[in-house]
């Protein structure tokens, strides 16, 4: 609450997060022309990345393009990309939607469709929908430990969200355990009024707000965090503005003296930890 | 503008960026002693890295040291590093400029020069100039979509820079489309009075400032962002303070049961998105 | 100092860091059943990662689990994980502490102990202590160059911590060179009253605070940074809250057409650069 006689100072904050959990992923895998059911385990090293403190990412879904190599191939026949003759293909042209540079030839993509030939990582990425349900939908049960150290330099005051009295096997609950800093990902979504299973398909951004309203006067000292949650990406966003949250990364390797890569389009939840508040003192 | 009767509150912000574009890179490649012109396509997975929201990096140039292995070799003969006898080389010495630990021996680097032998990733990185013009100079035509969600918790007000009425095929222009949040990288540099082609060689840091000056009173409500751009690294910086922007990373692999790496010195532009402003309400 | 007649504005900041140094690492390496002393050199590409400006990480220790493959194996026999019959193992159960999903069978881990069989990356990670002393303990002698560009947009004022008059071969010292922005990592710890050698084992988080108290009035202009250091992680933290600072990442590769990975548990120091302060003008 506003105490006008106090000297207010904004919080200086540092955050450290630790995600726990394993996911079992079942998907169709094609090897040597034969498609069978593949089963694999994802642990933290597989689904998360060493990121900065104020943000962490949990992969919940993915699309892989395996064995890509730099060569010539027909581009993916997305809407408006098909051709019937070389006239439709312009040598040196880079379509922002495409993944390569046109050679000027119109070539067969499959038995029924022709597209412009491109110099690219081939075969080019298929523009297929993210798997539904999400492959790592069980990430809903992962937990994240959030450690937050705060400082009011002007008041020479430092504290943290985890106190020595806290129990390391707790789980945050708005009513029963509002000071526990171990959060189940599904609970964060529930608190924000969002459906984890749904968001996991395309990905999204979730805000974890930590509000410190600190009264540093010795006679009425109070300085504990309050946690709240809200979705930060726009779920109603138009296709053209790239809804959800995804990024592409590659694993490179050599085979038969040719550099190859596996391209992974990773969908997931980026959690942004937004720390704010003030310290007031007479 | 300052309305003294209003209660002002700083903005809480979350940013999400998405870079688009492909670059055609032509460079000399040596294979089996034969040098020929190499040509490759770089897409987002090749030139950018999954980074936090408030910053993104676009690689514009690089120098590769391929096939390095942990062994003994002569260090690179940079200024002041040459020797004529073992006396000049101190066993166990690590020169901060060097890439290894001296064995105490002075050995031939090539037909004319001798340097201290080091235990290092060998052959050691050559201290050669970044290629000019930059290999990915066409990154000037890449575009970045910036999504910014802001919150004034005290006023319980949230908004974002992208409105439902916006057109996903727009490009930001200071006069004609100042609310469009898709930016051509070359335009950002032009607005900041900088030369992309020049900066792309050594790399640099570019600030994209998003200023929210929000009047949240219902009778004169206004809350839209204003974009501006400024270069953040010092282009006149002394050599000793490492001008530009680059970092080294490695790709590790095994060959004939020996661990090897390819070292990449990546030059590029780091874009920092700096969101600031206040929300005022009576 | 507070000048009440001035209009104060918080600082907008951008940071760029550059770490220098090489470490010599000696450890036991097992190859083909034979254990021998291994010796390797780590340079920046090996011990640090391309991170955002406000944070950088230096690996000081690690534990490797090599040649893991997705299959079935006994889980690690940590406290409370042993079994004597299948009844103790629940098919489909994922213990948050474990690294896999139970099959329901109790199988021999070694000659004396049995544990539940899991579907996981096998062999599962051994829960062994971080090496002591830390493998990259010599990181104490690494240096970091910190470049900080600040802006007070309301006052249209920009400056940086590195001035043209500065000497690129300086090292920060609180008394003798308090404006030098090249810091020896060991000195940062000493200034913060911490023992680098000790923290390097388990890792930790170190804050580098840069305080700008700027008087922008022309008649008494002053705007230079003040550096201070404090440890941000809780060294007295209970085991259950994961003391220190570490994360796991993996290097994936194929062998005999089987995907394998090397899991690295990296311990190290995350340095958070916390920039704050105000610019005041009449």
């Amino acid at each position: 609450s506003d105490k006008l006689y106090q000297r207010k100072e904004p919080v200086i904050s540092s955050v450290h997060t630790k995600v726990k959990g394993i996911a079992e992923v079942t998907e169709n895998v094609t090897e040597g022309g034969v498609t069978k059911l593949g089963h694999s385990i994802f642990d933290t090293a597989d689904y998360t990345f060493p990121l900065q403190g104020n943000s962490f990412f949990v992969m919940t879904n993915y699309v892989k393009s395996e064995g890509q190599v730099q060569t010539l191939c027909p581009e993916y026949p997305r809407r408006g990309a098909q051709c019937s003759s070389d006239r439709r293909c312009k040598k040196g042209w880079m379509d922002p939607q495409s993944k390569g540079i046109q050679t000027g030839r119109c070539v067969p993509y499959d038995k029924t469709r022709k597209t412009c030939e491109v110099s690219a990582w081939c075969p080019t990425e298929e523009e297929k929908e993210a798997p539904r349900p999400a492959l790592l939908r069980s990430a809903e049960n992962f937990t994240v430990l959030i450690k937050n150290n705060i400082h009011f330099p002007g008041h020479n005051y430092t504290t943290r969200n985890i106190l020595p009295t806290m129990n390391g096997s707790c789980t945050f609950h708005k009513t029963w355990d509002p000071q526990c800093s171990i959060f189940r990902l599904g609970d964060i979504f529930q608190e924000a009024g969002e459906n984890f299973t749904e968001v996991a398909v395309q990905g999204g951004i979730m805000g974890i707000e930590i509000y410190w309203d600190c009264n540093l006067d010795s006679w009425s000292h109070h300085c504990r965090p309050r946690y709240s949650f809200r979705r930060l990406d726009d779920k109603n966003m138009d296709e053209s503005f790239v809804p959800g949250y995804n990024f592409r990364y590659a694993k490179y390797y050599k085979e038969n003296n040719v550099e190859k890569r596996t391209l992974i389009k990773a969908f997931g939840i980026r959690f942004d930890i937004l720390v704010f508040g003030t310290g007031g003192k007479f | 503008s300052d309305k003294l009767y209003q209660r002002k509150e700083p903005v809480i912000s979350s940013v999400h960026t998405k870079v688009k574009g492909i670059a055609e890179v032509t460079e000399n490649v040596t294979e089996g002693g034969v040098t020929k012109l190499g040509h490759s396509i770089f897409d987002t997975a090749d030139y950018t890295f999954p980074l936090q929201g408030n910053s993104f990096f676009v690689m514009t140039n690089y120098v590769k040291s391929e096939g390095q292995v942990q062994t003994l070799c002569p260090e690179y003969p940079r200024r002041g590093a040459q020797c004529s006898s073992d006396r000049r080389c101190k066993k166990g010495w690590m020169d901060p400029q060097s890439k290894g630990i001296q064995t105490g021996r002075c050995v031939p680097y090539d037909k004319t020069r001798k340097t201290c032998e080091v235990s290092a990733w060998c052959p050691t990185e050559e201290e050669k100039e970044a290629p000019r013009p930059a290999l990915l100079r066409s990154a000037e035509n890449f575009t970045v979509l910036i999504k910014n969600n802001i919150h004034f918790p005290g006023h319980n007000y949230t908004t974002r820079n992208i409105l439902p009425t916006m057109n996903g095929s727009c490009t930001f222009h200071k006069t004609w489309d100042p609310q469009c949040s898709i930016f051509r990288l070359g335009d950002i540099f032009q607005e900041a009075g900088e030369n992309f082609t020049e900066v792309a060689v050594q790399g640099g840091i570019m600030g994209i400032e998003i200023y929210w000056d929000c009047n949240l009173d219902s009778w004169s409500h206004h809350c839209r962002p204003r974009y501006s751009f400024r270069r953040l690294d010092d282009k006149n910086m002394d050599e000793s303070f490492v001008p530009g922007y680059n970092f080294r990373y490695a790709k590790y692999y095994k060959e004939n049961n020996v661990e090897k790496r390819t070292l990449i010195k990546a030059f590029g532009i780091r874009f920092d998105i700096l969101v600031f402003g206040t929300g005022g309400k009576f | 100092s507070d000048k009440l007649y001035q209009r104060k504005e918080p600082v907008i900041s951008s940071v760029h860091t550059k770490v220098k140094g090489i470490a010599e690492v000696t450890e036991n390496v097992t190859e083909g059943g034979v254990t021998k002393l291994g010796h390797s050199i780590f340079d920046t590409a090996d011990y640090t990662f391309p991170l955002q400006g406000n944070s950088f990480f230096v690996m000081t220790n690690y534990v490797k689990s090599e040649g893991q493959v997705q299959t079935l194996c006994p889980e690690y026999p940590r406290r409370g994980a042993q079994c004597s019959s299948d009844r103790r193992c629940k098919k489909g159960w994922m213990d948050p502490q474990s690294k896999g999903i139970q099959t329901g069978r109790c199988v021999p881990y070694d000659k004396t102990r049995k544990t539940c069989e899991v579907s996981a990356w096998c062999p599962t990670e051994e829960e062994k202590e971080a090496p002591r002393p830390a493998l990259l303990r010599s990181a104490e002698n690494f240096t970091v160059l910190i470049k900080n560009n600040i802006h007070f947009p309301g006052h249209n004022y920009t400056t940086r911590n590195i001035l043209p008059t500065m000497n690129g071969s300086c090292t920060f010292h609180k008394t003798w060179d308090p404006q030098c922005s090249i810091f020896r990592l060991g000195d940062i710890f000493q200034e913060a009253g911490e023992n680098f050698t000790e923290v390097a084992v388990q890792g930790g988080i170190m804050g580098i605070e840069i305080y700008w108290d700027c008087n922008l009035d022309s008649w008494s202009h002053h705007c230079r940074p003040r550096y201070s250091f404090r440890r941000l992680d809780d060294k007295n933290m209970d085991e259950s809250f994961v003391p220190g600072y570490n994360f796991r990442y993996a290097k994936y590769y194929k062998e005999n057409n089987v995907e394998k990975r090397t899991l690295i548990k990296a311990f190290g120091i995350r340095f958070d650069i916390l920039v704050f302060g105000t610019g005041g003008k009449f």
């Epitope: 060569t71 040598k91 040196g92 540079i101 081939c122 040719v258 | - | -």
Partner: nanobody
């Protein structure tokens, strides 16, 4: 001038094996897709098998399981291992390659062909 030269053809008994080889020589930037086609007397040329630079393969139904196409990217060579040969495999086998002479300058090249005869 870029050339494709085939070898390895000949006369073989039904059920036997042959290995065809085709090498690209000359000055060029990159060899992309490579393939083997065949033409039997009085019939149209048909695709036998093709292989991308990334080693993805595709076979005609009539040879699937019997023939194997492979390539060596150092030597710019494509191979066709033919097992379980049948009399109906008798034809002139020609090598095809899509080669970039310079950057974004691809052209289609054909070899002269090599005769394969399978006797019953």
């Amino acid at each position: 001038e870029v050339q494709l030269v085939e070898s390895g053809g000949g006369l073989v008994q039904a059920g036997g094996s042959l290995r065809l080889l085709c090498a690209a020589s000359g000055s060029f930037f990159r060899v992309n897709n490579m393939a083997w086609y065949r033409q039997a007397p009085g019939k149209q040329r048909e695709l036998v098998a093709d292989i991308t630079r990334g080693d993805r393969t595709n076979y005609a139904d009539s040879v699937n399981g019997r023939f194997t196409i492979s390539r060596d990217n150092v030597r710019n060579t494509v191979y066709l291992q033919m097992n379980g040969l049948k009399p109906e495999d008798t034809a002139v086998y020609s090598c095809y390659a899509r080669i970039e002479l310079g950057i974004l300058e691809p052209r289609d090249y054909w070899g002269q062909g090599t005769q394969v005869t399978v006797s019953s």
